[in-house]
């Protein structure tokens, strides 16, 4: 056993190169210096190591850095990142956006893994808030990222970051999340003129209160039915038939197709039949 763990003569690795793919697991363990591995991590990804060999390399790094890897090593982990557990990642202190991007690239095209979720959580907590550049990066890799956060986590998003949010990033957000994001969006876009403001705020309107919808109805915005269907039920109910007609403009005819669905159904039920009849759509309250 002692002989087996000693590095055979002439096999001591002087650098991380392709010759190492022919090393058995025990040889890698015995002949590759952990410090050398740490300084030449960028070379590991260019070498077609087996999963078993990568396990050995990870073990060596774990022994060298029992308290967690330094960022200089983390940034160059590449495919070795896939070998990390959430427990490993919780020991890290990742502060560079470049490091985050490099690791997200490894997982690109896959669902968000527990490892990636932990990495993002560590990174965002380290920064103290979700700044615009971070949000840009995260939503580029994971369009549903924003909607995976709890309302409490979303409260740390500064209004300035809202500029990075695209409509598709909000597709899976629920009303509680939009309740948090809408006031931030309103603040972020407050200096825009009417039509430009509506284009930007539209995706966030699922968190808008009644008074803001009433205000929008006075601005000829022509809200589409898809947006109307995402509005908060409690915000829609107090709107009058005239206000909904103004809010939707030419899209008001779409109410007929949605009359069995919420929130349209709830709104129709609470209107006077005489008022509904003015729309000429055959809606029954």
């Amino acid at each position: 056993e002692v002989e087996k763990t000693a590095c055979p003569s002439g096999k001591k690795a002087r650098e991380i190169d392709e010759s190492l793919i022919f090393y058995k697991k025990w040889e890698l363990e015995a002949c590759v210096d952990a410090a050398l591995l740490a300084t030449q991590m960028d070379r590991v990804n260019a070498i077609p190591f087996t999963y078993e060999q990568l396990d050995v390399l990870k073990h060596k790094l774990d022994e060298l850095y029992p308290q967690g890897y330094p960022e200089s090593v983390i940034q160059h982990l590449g495919y070795l990142f896939l070998k990390m557990s959430p427990e490993d990642i919780r020991k890290w202190n990742v502060t560079s956006l470049e490091t985050l991007k490099a690791l997200l690239e490894v997982n690109k095209g896959h669902e968000m893994s527990p490892q990636v979720a932990t990495l993002i959580d560590r990174f965002v907590k380290g920064r103290g808030q979700l700044d615009k550049d971070t949000l840009d990066t995260l939503t580029a890799f994971y369009p549903g990222y924003l909607c995976s956060l709890s309302p409490e986590e979303l409260s740390s998003v500064p209004p300035s970051s809202i500029w990075a949010v695209r409509p598709q990033d909000l597709d899976t957000c629920d009303p509680r999340q939009l309740d948090v994001l809408y006031p931030k969006a309103r603040l972020a876009f407050q200096n825009m003129n009417g039509s430009e403001y509506f284009v930007k705020i539209q995706s966030f309107l699922g968190g808008a209160p009644t008074e803001d919808l009433k205000a929008l109805s006075q601005q000829n915005v022509s809200m589409d039915l898809a947006t109307f269907m995402k509005l908060r039920t409690d915000a829609v109910l107090p709107l009058t038939v005239a206000e909904v007609q103004k809010l939707l403009g030419p899209h008001v005819e779409g109410l007929k197709a949605e009359e069995r669905h919420r929130p349209v159904r709830d709104w129709i039920l609470r209107q006077r039949q005489d008022d509904l009849d003015t729309l000429g759509l055959g809606l029954q309250g």
Partner: antibody, heavy 119, light 107 residues
Amino acid sequence: QVQLQESGPGLVKPSETLSLTCTVSGGSVSSFTDTWSWIRQPPGKGLEWIGYIYYSGSTNYNPSLKSRVTISVDTSKNQFSLKLSSVTAADTAVYYCARDFVLSGFDIWGQGTMVTVSS
Amino acid sequence: DIQMTQSPSSLSASVGDRVTITCRASQSSRYYVNWYQQKPGKAPKLLIYAASSLQSGVPSRFSGSGSGTDFTLTISSLQPEDFATYYCQQSYDASYTFGGGTKVEIK
């Protein structure tokens, strides 16, 4: 605290009409935010929504029961009622009345009343 | 009508277990899905509304998630009083429908 109480006969003959009433206490049947539903549960089976009514009298029924169901409201008595015609043994169930709060769901239920259809 | 398919129909679990029940809608129900708990001889009780909002007075070990067609009810740490039957229900379409129920039994 809003409470609901179902009342009506526990035994109905086949082909006759089942009639139940739900009395609302501690709140108003004329609430802007609420609709009032009937839901049933055959013995050992799951829940089936029958229909709802709004205080204005507007109703909405389960399509599979629509031809036999009538739900009405009496705002002066703070009650709403269910009539189910041409009953068969398949209509034997526990019948519940429930409040459907527009912002949540069936948040308040009656304790349920067992109705058996048998000759 | 929107059909709600619940799975599993029954499960056995121990106190302290994490339990997950899923509900699939035959077409999008947006986030208009509610979850109820029913114990034998009792009326159902609302646990979760609008897919993920916890009804007042319901313990925080209950949580809901999902939107569109796939919804989940999770009990983070099963307690003795949680052994019951659970139902999902959609209210997006005017014809409300319930799932078939999931009976959670003691292992």
